[in-house]
């Protein structure tokens, strides 16, 4: 006869682990034990259960409730045994020893390797601006036994860097994500895409790339000048600019307070209808967290083109 | 080597309570039960319950129920056993001795007498 | 509960074998184990699960057990071998451990 056996057992940390031992022998044989024992380098062969055929399953007193027979149908000269509810401390060597009649006693060795699947943790860097050089957008770490493997899906340009630390049971894998922080970046998303024997997908944590910046700000309203004439209603000048964090909007005149009736409505200057009073140097400022842009316009109001004793005024804008 | 020490003879009035222990050395002492057997005076032996030293779960049999409790210290390798209630009939040497798997006893102690008298 | 019958005691001249028994209801289907005690001294185990010796016990000593009998057997017995000898199983049903009431071997001269 022969032992069936597994030289590795492998599961995940919680699930139950089934130890095999199966003796193929003569029809005629018998199984009077079987024998468990934890294999250990330090503390030698220590006893973890026993499996009779008289008066079935005792169980070693660590594993107490933490060990028993697969369920039925049993086949008698199956040895095998489930030890619940796997933890780290359980990976090992263990050892099983059939005693059979009348061909004697048979053992074989097996490795229980207990998988911990990592549980991933994103950490953003410190807030990207644009003009940085080389900046950490985000680190990811893991870890898990054996040591995870930790990588970054994304469409942004950028360098990934990693480093583990070995612990007793399990090891750590940080990496980090490197970029030089442009505009183009900003909402972009960055995953960190973490791999384990012990996981059945791959785990994937996804950061929304934030990158400060301000653009230039100007002016729009004054395209076509001949808009711009005394007794005009509506007339706006809209301040364009773009930012993160978005930007707020400011309106003065530069040769003094703004004229009464004009409205500042954010990025807006709102006209009432239009007298040559309103001629004159506009500012817009725009500002957020980041820096502070500025733009200026000169807006010369035309005479009423039905009134031709009036000068015509030409508007212009810098 | 594998050794059971047990703590020194005592002499108990009847309702008294007694607590008798049982260092253990020489083994990993949270992988064997302990089993506790008396043996009055010209007497067989009486089995009378089990602990794990790991869990600390217990075993009594039937006729101890409610009198005796087993305890462990896993810090000192020790393990106790109280039986309450004393009366004359419970005069006897008290063992403590390493269970294997399978419930048959491979290292005893040196045995404890327990004589209540008034 | 479950009961395990020892004769009280058995005489053998030395040399010569004696047979020891210990009876229960389908003591073949338990295993037993039998442990030697002599006075004033704690037992000590000489046969498990029916027919294994630990180590340091001689030969001499044997275990059989079928149907409703168990059987210690002690070869070639010396006068070292007096002693009280105590059957003992464990009892599945009722989760508790079960000895005998023990029987006195004498050797003879």
């Known amino acids: 006869g022969e032992l069936e056996t597994s030289d590795l057992v492998t599961v995940v940390l919680g699930q139950d682990a089934k130890l095999p031992c199966f003796y193929r022998g003569d029809p005629d044989e018998q199984v009077g034990q079987v024998a468990w024992a934890r294999v250990d380098p330090n503390e030698g062969t220590r006893e973890l259960a026993l499996l009779h055929s008289k008066y079935g399953l005792h169980v070693s007193p660590a594993y107490e409730d933490r060990v028993e027979q697969p369920p039925p149908p049993r086949d008698p000269l199956d040895g095998s045994i489930l030890l619940r509810n796997a933890v780290q401390a359980d990976e090992g060597e263990y050892e099983c020893r059939v005693s059979t009649f009348p061909a004697g006693s048979f053992q074989a060795r097996m490795r229980l390797r207990v998988l911990v699947p990592p549980l991933p943790s994103l950490n953003p860097g410190p807030p990207l601006e644009e003009g940085q050089g080389l900046t950490l957008a985000a680190s990811c770490t893991a870890e898990g036994s054996p040591a995870p493997s930790v990588t970054w899906d994304t469409e942004v340009k950028g360098t990934q860097s990693s480093r583990s630390f070995k612990h007793s049971r399990s090891a750590a894998v940080t990496s980090e994500f490197h970029l030089v922080p442009s505009r183009s970046m900003n909402g972009q998303p960055l995953t960190c895409v973490v791999s384990h024997p012990g996981l059945l997908q791959d785990q994937r944590i996804t950061h929304t790339l934030q990158v400060a910046f301000l653009a230039e700000a100007s002016v729009r309203g004054l395209e076509d000048q001949n808009l711009w004439h005394v007794g005009r209603e509506g007339a706006t000048l809209k301040c364009l600019s773009e930012g993160q964090p978005p930007p707020k909007y400011n309106w003065t005149r530069l040769d003094g307070p703004l004229p009464s009736g004009v409205r500042v409505k954010g990025d807006t200057l709102g006209f009432p209808p239009l007298t040559t009073e309103h001629s004159g140097v506009y500012v817009c400022h725009v500002s957020n967290e980041l820096s502070s842009r500025a733009s200026q316009v000169t807006v010369e109001v035309l005479a009423d083109p039905e009134d031709p004793g009036k000068q015509v005024d030409l508007v212009s804008a810098s | 080597q594998v050794q059971l020490v047990q703590s020194g003879a005592e002499v108990k009035k009847p309702g008294a309570s007694v607590k008798v222990s049982c260092k253990a050395s020489?083994?990993?002492?949270?992988?064997?039960?302990m089993h506790w057997v008396r043996q009055a005076p010209g007497q067989g032996l009486e089995w009378m319950g089990i602990?794990?030293?790991?869990?600390?779960?217990?075993t009594y049999a039937q006729k101890f129920q409610g009198r005796v409790t087993m305890t462990r210290d896993t810090s000192t390798s020790t393990v106790y056993m109280e039986l309450s209630s004393l009366r004359s009939e419970d005069t006897a040497v008290y063992y403590c001795?390493?269970?294997?798997?399978?419930?048959?006893?491979?290292?005893w102690g040196q045995g404890t007498l327990v004589t209540v008298s008034s | 509960s479950y009961v395990l019958t020892q004769p009280p005691s058995v005489s053998v001249a030395p040399g010569q074998t004696a047979r020891i028994t210990c009876g229960g209801n389908n003591i073949g289907s338990k295993s037993v184990h039998w442990y030697q005690q002599k006075p004033g001294q704690a037992p000590v185990l000489v046969v498990y699960?029916?027919?294994d010796r630990p180590s340091g016990i001689p030969e001499r000593f044997s275990g059989s057990n079928s149907g409703n009998t168990a059987t210690l057997t002690i070869s070639r017995v010396e006068a070292g071998d007096e002693a009280d000898y105590y059957c003992?199983?464990?009892?599945?049903?009722?989760?508790?451990?079960?000895f005998g009431g023990g029987t006195k071997l004498t050797v003879l001269g």
């Open positions: 003992q199983v464990w009892d599945r049903s009722s989760d508790q451990v079960v």
């Open positions: 001795a390493r269970g294997r798997l399978g419930t048959y006893f491979d290292y």
């Open positions: 602990i794990n030293p790991s869990g600390g779960s217990t």
């Open positions: 699960d029916d027919s």
């Open positions: 020489g083994y990993t002492f949270t992988g064997y039960y």
